[in-house]
Interface confidence: low
C-alpha cells in the first residue's frame, strides 16, 4: 500500500533571484485532487493553500509581494490528497538581490578573444563579502562561485564559441542575499568560420530572463517563464 504521494515540483516565477522589494511567486505543482498544499520555509510551515475545486487544479501559487532578506532562503512544498501526504519537493533556494552594493566585472585578456584562448573574469566588490557569483545570461546552470576578500577570479580556461554571451557577477553576503548585479560584460569568441553562426544559447532558459529579472515591474509577473534549471540551485548549496 502506498504510504506517500510523489513529490511536487517547486519553482519560482519569474526567477529564483529576486531583487529586493520586488515580487515573486513560488509555484508548487502536485496532483489533481490535492486538497491542501503547504509551503515550508527553512523547515517551518510558512503558508497553506487549499485549491478549489481540487479535482481541477494541480498547481498553487504562493505570492511574495515584496522580497527582502528575511524572505530569502530554502523553500519546499508538500500536498495532501485525502489523508495521504506527498513526499516533500526538492528545495528551492530563493535569493534576494540588489543588496547594499554593486560589484565590477572585468575580463582578461579582453572581451573579444579567439577560440582556444584562456579567459578569466574578475569580480570585485569592496564591501564585506567573500563569496562571488558569475552568471552567464541565457542559461541558469552557468553559475560559478568564487572566493576572495575583495575580488574573485573565474578562470574559464580555453574558451570555445559556446562561451560567448553576456556575463554578470554578484557579491554574496550569504547564500541567499546577493548584491546588485554588475554591469554586463559581453564576451565575443570568434572561432573557425563554420562555427561562427549564432545559434540560440539554450532553449531551456529564455534569453529575456535577465530583462525580466532586472525590470520586474509592479504591473505583474511574467507568467510563461520556463522552469529554471536545478543546477544553479545546487551550486548554492
Amino acid at each position: 500500500q502506498q504510504q506517500t504521494l510523489p513529490k511536487p515540483f517547486i519553482w519560482a516565477e519569474p526567477h529564483f533571484m529576486v531583487p529586493k522589494e520586488k515580487q515573486v511567486t513560488i509555484c508548487c505543482q502536485g496532483n489533481y485532487g490535492a486538497v491542501e498544499y503547504q509551503l515550508h520555509f527553512e523547515g517551518s510551515l510558512f503558508a497553506v493553500d487549499r485549491p478549489k475545486p481540487p479535482e481541477r487544479i494541480n498547481k498553487v501559487q504562493f505570492y511574495i509581494p515584496d522580497m527582502n532578506s528575511r524572505m530569502a532562503g530554502q523553500y519546499s512544498c508538500i500536498y495532501r490528497v485525502g489523508e495521504l501526504w506527498s513526499e516533500p519537493s526538492n528545495l528551492l533556494d530563493l535569493v534576494v538581490t540588489e543588496m547594499y552594493d554593486t560589484p565590477t566585472l572585468s575580463v582578461h585578456p579582453g572581451p573579444e578573444v579567439i577560440s582556444g584562448e584562456k579567459v578569466t573574469f574578475y569580480c570585485r566588490l569592496d564591501t564585506a563579502t567573500s563569496m562571488f557569483l558569475l552568471l552567464k545570461e541565457g542559461r541558469s546552470s552557468h553559475v560559478q562561485r568564487g572566493y576572495g576578500k575583495v575580488q574573485a577570479e573565474f578562470p574559464l580556461g580555453p574558451v570555445t564559441t559556446a562561451h560567448r554571451g553576456t556575463y554578470r557577477c554578484f557579491g554574496s553576503y550569504n547564500n541567499h542575499a546577493w548584491s546588485f548585479p554588475s554591469e554586463p560584460v559581453k564576451l565575443l569568441v570568434t572561432g573557425d568560420i563554420e562555427n561562427t553562426s549564432l545559434a540560440p544559447e539554450d532553449p531551456t532558459f529564455p534569453a529575456d530572463t535577465w530583462g525580466t529579472y532586472l525590470l520586474t515591474t509592479e504591473t505583474g509577473l511574467q507568467k510563461d517563464h520556463a522552469l529554471w534549471d536545478h543546477t544553479a540551485q545546487n551550486l548554492l548549496r
Epitope: E21, Q23, F62, Y63, P65, D66, M67, E218, G220
Partner: antibody, heavy 120, light 107 residues
Framework: QVQLQQSGPELVKPGASVKMSCKAS????????INWGKQRSGQGLEWIGE????????YYNEKFKAKATLTADKSSNIAYMQLSSLTSEDSAVYFC?????????????WGQGTSVTVSS | DIQMTQTTSSLSASLGDRVTISCRAS??????LNWYQQKPDGTVKLLIY???RLHSGVPSRFSGSGSGTDYSLTINNLEQEDIATYFC?????????FGGGTKLEIK
C-alpha cells in the same frame, strides 16, 4: 489613486457575527497584501492579520485567530473580515490597510475604518 | 510579542516649533520601524517607513531616525495640519505591533 473604501458602521448583538468589507481601487488588488487592525476608543492599534489576495494565504495574530476570518474576492477587488462570537470587547473601529511593497512591513494606504458596536 | 512604547501620550507645541516624538521597542527591531499619522477624524496615513524613509507625498518637514530599540519622529516647523496622533509600528517580527500613540496639540 489608491483607495480603500470600507463598509459602514455596524450595531450588533452579543454572540452574533459581523462581516465587513474593504474595496480596493487604483492598483492591482492581487499584487499587495491587505492588513486588518483594531482600534478601541481612544487607544492604540492592534494588528489582527493579513491576507494575500493573490493566493488567499493569510497570517493571523494569535490573539485573533479564533475571532477573525480574512477572505478576499479577486473578481471584485474586495477584502473581507468576519468577526464571530462578538462581545463588548469587540466594540472598536476596524481598519483595513494595504501593505506597501517595500519589503519593510509598512502599511502605505488605509481605509477610513468601520465602527462596530456590540450592544444588546 | 514585541512591545512598542510611546512614553509621551500627549504633548503641546506651538506652530513653527520643532517637535520630537519617541518610540521604544522591547527588543532590537533592526530599523523596521514605521510612523503613522491619525487625524482627529480617524484618517490614518503612513509618514515614514524603515526608520527614516519618507513615504510619497509626505512633506519634508517630517523625518525619522533611530536604531536598535530607540526611534524618533521629528516634525520641523509645526503646522496646524500636523495636529494629530502619531503611532509607531514595528515591522520586524509578526505580529506587527503599534505604540500607544502620541497626541499632538497646539499650545
Amino acid at each position: 489613486q489608491v483607495q480603500l473604501q470600507q463598509s459602514g458602521p455596524e450595531l450588533v448583538k452579543p454572540g452574533a457575527s459581523v462581516k465587513m468589507s474593504c474595496k480596493a481601487s487604483g492598483y492591482t488588488f492581487t499584487d499587495y497584501v491587505i492588513n486588518w487592525g483594531k482600534q478601541r476608543s481612544g487607544q492604540g492599534l492592534e494588528w489582527i492579520g493579513e491576507i494575500y489576495p493573490g493566493s488567499g494565504t493569510n497570517y493571523y495574530n494569535e490573539k485573533f485567530k479564533a475571532k477573525a476570518t480574512l477572505t478576499a474576492d479577486k473578481s471584485s477587488n474586495i477584502a473581507y473580515m468576519q468577526l464571530s462570537s462578538l462581545t463588548s470587547e469587540d466594540s472598536a473601529v476596524y481598519f483595513c490597510a494595504r501593505r506597501g511593497r517595500y519589503g519593510l512591513y509598512a502599511m502605505d494606504y488605509w481605509g477610513q475604518g468601520t465602527s462596530v458596536t456590540v450592544s444588546s | 510579542d514585541i512591545q512598542m512604547t510611546q512614553t509621551t501620550s500627549s504633548l503641546s507645541a506651538s506652530l513653527g516649533d520643532r517637535v520630537t516624538i519617541s518610540c521604544r521597542a522591547s527588543q532590537d527591531i533592526s530599523n523596521y520601524l514605521n510612523w503613522y499619522q491619525q487625524k482627529p477624524d480617524g484618517t490614518v496615513k503612513l509618514l515614514i517607513y524603515y526608520t527614516s524613509r519618507l513615504h510619497s507625498g509626505v512633506p519634508s518637514r517630517f523625518s525619522g531616525s533611530g536604531s536598535g530599540t530607540d526611534y524618533s519622529l521629528t516634525i520641523n516647523n509645526l503646522e496646524q495640519e500636523d495636529i494629530a496622533t502619531y503611532f509607531c509600528q514595528q515591522g520586524n517580527t509578526r505580529p506587527w505591533t503599534f505604540g500607544g500613540g502620541t497626541k499632538l496639540e497646539i499650545k
